[in-house]
């Protein structure tokens, strides 16, 4: 019958070659003569030449040794011809299954591995897994079956079996308790993978695992007991730095110290951080501390880790004496801004009133006063008992130095100290108004027709405050009512000047006294430019000519 | 056994065809193989292809694919090789030699004493 | 193609020595590789297939080696009659290829 089994021929064959497999023999041979040939990858096609066959025989030929790792099958067709070239038979299937030898060492993936796992972890727990390849077949043979084994590890601490390894997937897991970071942060395995199952061939690999840090050590103060010295009243002056000692991986959360006052401050005077670098704790006042309320404070701190303890650990505490210093405080002005009611134009030498100072300190020390800011020169200030006094003339209106109604000056307190020290107080003066402003018209030119004039409105302005303004009164004096009017509006705010007999072309003084509703009488002379002209008028010529 | 390569020397015309015979006696030709080979004037050793008579099988060297032309006659003994579209580069000595067939991997024992072709106008 | 390598390209030598041609194949063509020998106007002899076997009738001063890519013939003790061109084949796969040839001459 026209066809053929499958052929096996193991790998690695030492021949001699060509070597005789299997013979292709057609039925149709009898009476004709039967010529072979085969076809395929590995006959006549890449690679060529592996196997051949004899073309009157049917021999099919092995040229060469085969790789299975290579070419693990070859599928060939036989063919059969008759003389005049004609086939007798349909192409044959021809299987060539390469067979495993084993050829081949296990390799592993990575000549090293990395690996880490936390310290202190139970037995079982999973480290890592390496890998070994081996190309010969592992499915029909055990040629290619890899078993795992540690051959050693180092350090041997705290003994020499910390690990182990599956056989089959080379998974590495903690065999042992007591694995400490602190003590050994890196163990080297040299692993083996032996293939046929652990019977054959072994190549090596080394495993690094890397033991990685847990919180199992708490910070220690080192020391455990400060004393400090701090001047009364410095705020953020750094008080202490307090020292810690961790065996935890350096700049970890593990490592890196978190301080907390327990007690001894009441007042919220004080506040400790963590120096980013050296992990020690810096004490610093949040507010000034007093002297004279309590000279020293008694601070318990404790540290902990950023990151949480993984088991129960005893904290430490510090105890730090903070002793406050004396320092000879300025005088305080009580109030800081005293504000006073003072008339305006008092006269000069009256009292305006008593501004005085307090000393924090506990001695009695004298304090002197001085002005040190007055603008106007209107104050004098008596250095023994802070009485000041006027020595000008204080006027509200004067728009230079009072703004609003205020005239502001500044005093200053000394003590006799040793430095001597001082302090500022600001004295708010305001001024109640007098009538000392009589009403002035504005504005104080007009030009105006001799014919059908136009009336000239003025506005009246007085410095002074109500009740000592409008409403206005108005007075033509000094003979100006024989040929002026001058009447105030209904509101009492503006004066209307107008001419009443014809003037000829010139300019006139007009007398008008306005007195405000404080009968407080201004005189002002109005300078009255008449023009040869009717109604409006802006301007014109003429010789100048009193009235 | 003997290869007798019996067409004389060959001066033929650029463009032209040329078909050399070689006469097999001694074995039996149809069970081996016919190879051809070419030898330019002071040059190497050229495999053109060669013919199972048998079966009529050939197998050629890509370089001479559509150049040569293979063929044997079983009743004669007697193997051919036509070269077409000739050139000066085909004038050479061209060799006939026997190769037994054991899957084709024996090498060439008996050889013919080759036909020069000449090419020239 | 298989590219052979022969060396050297040619060669001097005197009656009675020991010479020794080699030949590189491309790649592997394991043991077959032929060597030949040819005179002026004759055709190629077979000397040695399979890299070692000798063809009929050839003298046992002749000695091929090598497989895989590295191949020798040795012709111990020279003769006259020994002197002409070698060629090395590889007869493993088509297309077949010579080795250019090594002219050994008489000193």
């Known amino acids: 019958e026209w066809v053929m089994p499958p052929i096996f021929v193991p790998e690695n064959g030492k021949g001699p070659f060509p070597q005789r497999l299997n013979q292709l023999k057609s039925n149709k041979d009898r009476g004709t003569k039967i010529f072979y040939s085969i076809t395929g990858p590995g006959a006549d096609s890449p690679p060529e030449g592996v196997f051949a066959v004899e073309k009157e025989t049917g021999w099919l030929l092995l040229n060469k040794p085969l790789d299975r790792e290579e070419i693990a099958k070859y599928e060939l067709f036989g063919h059969a011809v008759s003389e005049n070239g004609a086939s007798v038979e349909d192409p044959m299937n021809i299987s060539i299954i390469v067979t495993d030898q084993n050829d081949h060492k296990p390799k592993f993936t990575q000549d090293t591995f990395r690996g880490s796992v936390l310290e202190g972890v139970l037995p079982g727990t999973s480290v890592m897994q390496v890998t070994a390849t081996d190309e010969d077949d592992a499915i029909y043979t055990y040629n290619g079956v890899v078993a795992y084994s540690i051959h050693s590890q180092e350090p041997k601490d705290p003994h020499d079996l910390m690990f182990t390894i599956h056989r089959s997937t080379g998974t590495i897991s903690v065999i042992s308790s007591g694995l400490d970071r602190e003590k050994v942060p890196e163990y080297t395995l040299t692993i083996q993978a032996t293939d046929m199952d652990g019977d054959g061939s072994t190549t090596t690999a080394v495993a690094v695992v890397e033991i990685l840090d847990a919180n199992d050590n708490a910070p220690m103060f080192d020391p455990q007991k400060y004393e400090a010295h701090v001047p009364e009243n410095a705020v953020g002056h750094e008080v202490q730095r307090l020292t810690v000692t961790d065996l935890d991986a350096p700049n970890s959360p593990a490592w890196r110290a978190t301080y907390l006052i327990m007690g001894g401050d009441d007042g919220d005077h004080f506040t400790i951080t963590t120096h980013p670098e050296s992990n020690q704790g810096i004490l610093t006042t949040r507010k000034g501390l007093d002297f004279e309320a309590k000279n020293q404070h008694t601070l318990y701190v404790e540290v902990t880790n950023e990151a949480p303890f993984v088991l129960k650990l005893p904290t430490s505490t510090a105890t730090i004496v903070v002793h406050v210093e004396d320092v000879n405080e300025a005088p305080v002005f009580v109030p800081p801004s005293k504000v006073v009611e003072v008339q305006e134009g008092i006269p000069t030498g009256e009292p305006v009133c008593v501004y005085t100072a307090e000393d924090p300190d506990k001695e009695n020390q004298k304090i002197s006063y001085r002005i040190l800011r007055d603008p106007a020169g209107w104050l004098a200030m008596d250095p023994d008992s802070g009485q000041v006094t006027a020595v000008g003339t204080l006027d509200r209106e004067d728009e230079q130095f009072v703004r609003n109604n205020i005239y502001e000056v500044m005093v200053l307190a000394m003590d006799n100290g040793s430095p001597p020290t001082t302090g500022t107080g600001t004295l708010l003066l305001t001024l109640i108004d007098v009538n000392d402003h009589g009403p002035v018209p504005e504005p104080r030119q007009i030009t105006i027709c001799n014919q059908s004039p136009v009336r000239q409105v003025l506005n009246i302005t007085d410095k002074d405050l109500s009740p000592h303004t409008s409403p206005f009164q108005a007075q033509l004096t000094d003979d100006s009512d024989i040929y002026w009017t001058a009447e105030v509006n209904e509101e009492g705010d503006t004066v209307v000047l107008s001419l009443k007999k014809f003037l000829k072309q010139d300019t006139y003084d007009v007398h008008l006294s306005l007195s405000d509703h404080g009968n407080k009488e201004q005189l002002t002379v109005i300078r009255a430019t008449v023009c040869d002209c009717h109604g409006h008028v802006e301007t014109c010529p003429g010789p100048w000519k009193g009235g | 056994v003997q290869l007798v390569e019996e067409s004389g020397p060959e001066l033929v015309k650029p463009g032209a065809s040329v078909k050399i015979s070689c006469k097999a006696s001694?074995?039996?030709?149809?069970?081996?193989?016919m190879n051809w080979v070419k030898q330019r004037p002071g040059k190497g050793l050229e495999w053109i292809g060669r013919?199972?008579?048998?079966?009529?099988?050939?197998k050629y060297n890509g370089k001479f694919k559509g150049k040569a032309t293979l063929t044997a006659d079983k009743s004669s003994s007697t193997a051919y090789m036509q070269l077409s579209s000739l050139t000066s580069e085909d004038s050479a000595v061209y060799f006939c030699?026997?190769?037994?067939?054991?899957?084709?991997?024996?090498?060439?024992?008996?050889w013919g004493q080759g036909t020069s072709v000449t090419v020239s106008s | 193609e298989l590219v052979m390598t022969q060396s050297p390209a040619s060669l001097s030598a005197s009656v009675g020595e020991t010479v020794t041609i080699t030949c590189r194949a491309s790649?592997?063509?394991?043991?077959?590789l032929a060597w030949y020998q040819q005179k002026q106007g004759k055709s190629p002899q077979l000397l040695v297939y399979?890299?070692?076997t000798l063809a009929e009738g050839v003298p046992s001063r002749f000695s091929g080696s090598g497989s895989g890519t590295q191949f020798s013939l040795k012709i111990n003790s020279l003769q006259p009659e020994d002197f002409g061109t070698y060629y090395c084949?590889?007869?493993?796969?088509?297309?077949?290829?010579f080795g250019a040839g090594t002219k050994l001459e008489i000193k």
């Open positions: 030699a026997r190769q037994r067939d054991y899957g084709a991997l024996y090498a060439m024992d008996y």
């Open positions: 001694g074995y039996a030709f149809s069970s081996s193989w």
């Open positions: 013919i199972y008579p048998g079966d009529g099988e050939t």
């Open positions: 790649d592997d063509i394991y043991s077959y």
């Open positions: 399979n890299a070692k």
């Open positions: 084949q590889n007869h493993y796969v088509t297309p077949f290829t």
